[in-house]
Every structure is written in C-alpha cells, then in structure tokens.
C-alpha cells in the first residue's frame, strides 16, 4: 500500500507534514515521526533550546540560542543576581541584596569599616585606629599633632 503525501505507517494512519511556524518547527523522518529542527525540542518541536549554560531557573528563551533573564537576574547565562541599586562594595546571592564585603558596612556597603587600612591617613608615624564607619583616630608621636599628625 502506498500512502498519500504526508501519510505514513501501516494503514497510512499517521500524518506528518513539515512545518516551521507557531505550531512547531520540524521535518518528518521516513516513518512519519517529527524530527525537530536545530534549536527546537518538545513533542511538537515548539520549545526553543536556549543558549548552552542558560540558567534553567532564572533564564528562558522563545528563540533558539537566546537566554532572557527573569527580573532580578543578569549576565550571559542569567546566573548573576542584580544587587540592590547603589550597592557599592557588596554582592548578592538573591536579587536586590547588598551583602557587604569585608571591612565595608551600611545599607549600600559604602561605609568604610577599615578606614585606616584603606586610606592610611595618619602621617609621620602616627598610629591609626578605626572608630566607626568612615571614622578613624590618629595617635601622633611626640612632636606631631593634628587629625592626621600632619602638624
């Protein structure tokens, strides 16, 4: 028995006609099975295969090779969270966080907790002590004075 065009199988009771549109992106093999075009998958070949490495949790795509990030995520693979706007010396594990790096504090991690180490403000052999965020105190050697032992 020879089947009509696009019909396959015993009794010609299987149909497959290649298509490339909203309903699917596939060709047909010699048995009438849908074979997805490159970049497509799923029973009807209408799900795009995203960029390799695209986060399955935070990225998606409607076109093959794409990787569109969910709100709050960024990067080529949508695997990097977006920190709180204005976060200076901080990182995030989840979107909009601002987790401060060592020696930084404040809501935006913009307050230096180690002003002495970062700026070394004490001159002429003065000893620096961190007294609070962005605050320090210099103990000046004999013969020197001023906030930074500059006098």
């Amino acid at each position: 028995v020879t089947c009509d065009d696009y019909y396959y199988g015993f009794g010609c009771n299987k149909f497959c006609r290649p298509r490339d549109d909203f309903f699917g992106h596939y060709a047909c093999d010699q048995n009438g099975n849908k074979t997805c075009m490159e970049g497509w998958m799923g029973p009807e070949c209408n799900r795009a295969i995203c960029r390799q490495g695209c986060s399955p949790k935070h990225g998606s795509c409607k076109l093959p090779g794409d990787c569109r990030c969910q709100y709050g995520w960024q990067g080529l693979y949508c695997d990097k969270c977006i920190p709180h706007p204005g976060c200076v010396h901080g990182i995030c594990n989840e979107p909009w966080q601002c987790l401060c790096e060592t020696n930084w504090g404040g809501q935006l991690c913009d307050k230096d907790l180690n002003y002495c180490g970062t700026h070394q403000p004490c001159l002429n052999g003065g000893t620096c002590s961190n007294t609070g965020p962005d605050k320090y105190q210099c103990s000046c050697p004999e013969g020197y004075s001023g906030p930074n032992c500059e006098i």
């Epitope: 019909y7 209408n46 799900r47 409607k62």
Partner: antibody, heavy 116, light 107 residues
Amino acid sequence: QVQLVQSGAELKKPGASVKVSCKVSGYAFTDYAIHWIRQAPGQGLEWMGIINTYYGDSKYAQKFQGRVTMTVDTSTSTAYMELSSLRSEDTAVYYCARGYDGFAYWGQGTLVTVSS
Amino acid sequence: DIQMTQSPSSLSASVGDRVTITCRTSENIYSYLTWYQQKPGKAPKLLIYHAKILDSGVPSRFSGSGSGTDFTLTISSLQPEDFATYYCQHHYDIPWTFGGGTKLEIK
C-alpha cells in the same frame, strides 16, 4: 486519564467581565496548547483562540481581539479565559480543549449567561 | 481567514443508510481537517483528524477523505446513536474555523 475540568456556570451583567478556568490532569500541562471554543444556544462552534501553555503566548480570533485574554498558571496546571465588555450575544457555553491535531479532549463546558 | 462551507446544513436519513457530509475550504489546507460529532448538551467528540485518520475508539463505519479544499465525511451504515450534529474544522492556520454544522436527523 486526561481530564479538563472547567469552572461552574456564571451569570453576568452587560459590560462586566467573566473569567473561566480549565484545570487539566493526566498529562504534562506544558506539552499541549489549550484552545477555547464557544457555542451560543442552538448555534455552531466558534473558535476563540489558543494559548501555548509552555510560554504563555496566545493567539486570538480577530473577532475577540481586545476583549479576550488567555492565561495559564503552570503551578496548578490551569488555563484561564477572560472575556470583558460582555454583551447579550456572549451568552454561550465556553469550552476549553487540548490539541494540535484536532481536539481529542474537551472540558465539560461552562455556561456564561449575560443578562441585565 | 479560511472560510469553511459545510453541506448540507441538515439531513434526514434512516438507520442503515449511507450518509455523506461535505466540507469545502476557501483555500488549500492540505489535510489539516478534523470532523467532530456533537450530541445535545455534550461537548463535541473527535471522529477524524488529518482528513482521514480515525480517532481511537471511533467505529469503522465512519470514514473521511479529501485534501486541499474538498473533504468528505461518510457514515457507511447509520446506527441509531449516529443521529447528532457534525462539524468540520481546519487546523492549518490561525484562526481554526469550524464549518456551520450538519444536523443529522431520523427520517
């Protein structure tokens, strides 16, 4: 087994909106599109639109463009059809159906009556 | 949009008769045509898809033929349970329009 279970009958006033749900079971929800079809009393079948359950993309018949919104909630395997600015001519049984090669599975239908 | 012209709109026949319903489309839809049977108060039931493939569980007295623009549903020997309304529908492109229906009544 595959089942599509729709929400109950609705009585609405002209100008109002109605939202009909269609909860599916027995297969992977995002593997198949959901279509919405309606049938006015004593009339034929009228195709309203389709929603791709994986992406949430929908396509509507021109007649309903601007008045219909089809959505899905993949966490509950439920499709929704909302029709706004209702008029008496929208009185009909609304069906959801699953398919690509015709509709092998249908919901039981939801009667929406629009009357003042 | 693709227009679907189904004929006849109603038909009286007797048990054992051979019945043919036709569906014509305004443009080539290849074999993207489906036939449904609907009984009062019930959702439609799929009979035939892709013009001639019988859905599982559908009796072999139902058959479909055609491609392109002209399609036929044939019931070879009417049974009492076959009295219902029949619809064709294309699923080639959006919108998936239905034919107007054929009401099959007992003569």
